[in-house]
Interface confidence: medium
Amino acid sequence: AQGKEVVLLDFAAAGGELGWLTHPYGKGWDLMQNIMNDMPIYMYSVCNVMSGDQDNWLRTNWVYRGEAERIFIELKFTVRDCNSFPGGASSCKETFNLYYAESDLDYGTNFQKRLFTKIDTIAPDEITVSSDFEARHVKLNVEERSVGPLTRKGFYLAFQDIGACVALLSVRVYYKKCPELLQGLAHFPETIAGSDAPSLATVAGTCVDHAVVPPGGEEPRMHCAVDGEWLVPIGQCLCQAGYEKVEDACQACSPGFFKFEASESPCLECPEHTLPSPEGATSCECEEGFFRAPQDPASMPCTRPPSAPHYLTAVGMGAKVELRWTPPQDSGGREDIVYSVTCEQCWPESGECGPCEASVRYSEPPHGLTRTSVTVSDLEPHMNYTFTVEARNGVSGLVTSRSFRTASVSINQTEPPKVRLEGRSTTSLSVSWSIPPPQQSRVWKYEVTYRKKGDSNSYNVRRTEGFSVTLDDLAPDTTYLVQVQALTQEGQGAGSKVHEFQTLSPEGSGNLAV
């Protein structure tokens, strides 16, 4: 921003009314009036070029300093060429000196040279030669100097003539201010420019209405340079929640829009499934039945819990059940759907029911499932099971209602025993088996059926309460088909698959090779 000038003294504008002091009185500098463009102009001039050494002083009136720290002095003047005078006037000069003196009071006509400090020798860029002067075409020079820091109540300027032919047409004294400024949504007051050229006055800004310094951000500051220019902005303000930047101000979000934090971003349209927001909204409330999860951004549509899984099947396979379902028809507008499976078992005899999580085994943890199927094993035979599959999403926890589908299945058989050959000889086979522990209590006996492979006419049966049996009196080097089946009070359980086991040949050494 361009510096602002505050004028303390303007000779040209005063119309000859200032009454400056000349010393020696009546000699040297003289106030003259000319007409230019039909307007009177005043000037102080001196032209004692032929009279030897000169020491003519012109002192301004006392100037009140006010708040100025550094003053700028702009001079407009003409200087005649010494060669335009007869004989070149040996004592003629083409410069004059500029002085100043500070004081806390106006000395009036009491003029003392010793109080004045020289600012500079003022030399013209262009001198007015004879031909110019005769053609009334004078060369006007403009020079500017500055002084500071000033500390007293006021000051004088003085012009010392040492034998030049000078006309002072304008003396303008001013100081500079950095103008009032709005930048980065911060207001910076009009500030007096500093006095020392290298230094910059640091000025704190204040955030405009409805703007704030962001958390962790720097307070707005700018630097007012000597020349009245603002430099080096630091920090900024941002429009607070519910407001957006419009030119240099913060304006409330329109109805139907919101802004949830102080930021540079504009207000956003309220998302789907929200209620109408008032002017200056920081968020948009959800419609009835719709919710926001704690981690949902304010710009995300409000959502609702999903509907129940669309289709659920339970397929029994021995003592296992495979549960399959399809996703809810209504996701509630979210993608974070997970499923939970719970299990209830009922005893047909008593009709008593209870949870069965502790006694069954799931192919993967039954809570937080993302897939749409799971296998449940270790089910007890002759038991009724009800499986519940619940669909949940990020806002399900905000409502009491649940979205679930159930499927029931009756387990009529035990799981087939898992059979293995423990040992063999030329005339015997040692066989063992296992079934899941929850089912063992329901088993009365195990039935082992065996026959020679290829002989479909005859077979042998052995019953035992244990988990192993040795089949004796077998033919050497012969393959036998062996199957184990659990027997329960209610009837037969599922049979194992038919295994082929071979006895050793007579040449085979060792009695029991596994």
Epitope: G256, F257, E272, T274, S277
Partner: antibody, heavy 118, light 106 residues
Framework: QVQLKESGPGLVAPSQSLSITCTVS????????VHWVRQPPGKGLEWLGM???????DYNSALKSRLSISKDNSKSQVFLKMNSLQTDDTAMYYC????????????WGQGTSVTVSS | DIQMTQTTSSLSASLGDRITISCRAS??????LNWYQQKPDGTVKLLIY???RLHSGVPSRFSGSGSGTDYSLTISNLEQEDIATYFC????????FGGGTKLEIK
Amino acid sequence: QVQLKESGPGLVAPSQSLSITCTVSGFSLSRYSVHWVRQPPGKGLEWLGMIWGGGSTDYNSALKSRLSISKDNSKSQVFLKMNSLQTDDTAMYYCARKHGNYYTMDYWGQGTSVTVSS
Amino acid sequence: DIQMTQTTSSLSASLGDRITISCRASQDISNYLNWYQQKPDGTVKLLIYYTSRLHSGVPSRFSGSGSGTDYSLTISNLEQEDIATYFCQQGYTLYTFGGGTKLEIK
């Protein structure tokens, strides 16, 4: 100031598809949603569908299978595509800006006339 | 789908009259009711949104009221420039328009 302008083919043969572009100025398509509405000659207004600032879409359930709405935020353009046109799809087609979340249309284009005829 | 019914399809009135146009929804629409003006040249403008809020730039002679399923638009001092067709529209569940009421000068 807010402006919307539709541009379309004018004449479309039966069973062909229709593409209309709505070019907007004075607002950002990433912040505001845009609706499509049509008006058959001498009849009332019928809402076709909309595209939200975030890009998701809603359609009139009776026309959903034939409609597609998309947009290009950087070009400030919204596109309506409608398939399998019949003579009763002859209408003036308007695009309109959605106003906040008051479920209303605060600024409308001047409309583009579409005639379905062989 | 929600149906919107404007029972009066055309209405004739004199300049300076106070007129009321009504609109009924097939279910409660919780004040999500808007009114539009369509001039004979096809230009459509929003007049009233959310039952009673006047859109910017709309003269104050237009006002809206209602709740539940019944809503109305009132023009208090009819002017020549108000000759147009007026449509109501619900925004409670997607969007549907009424059939329109054509306003003419006697």
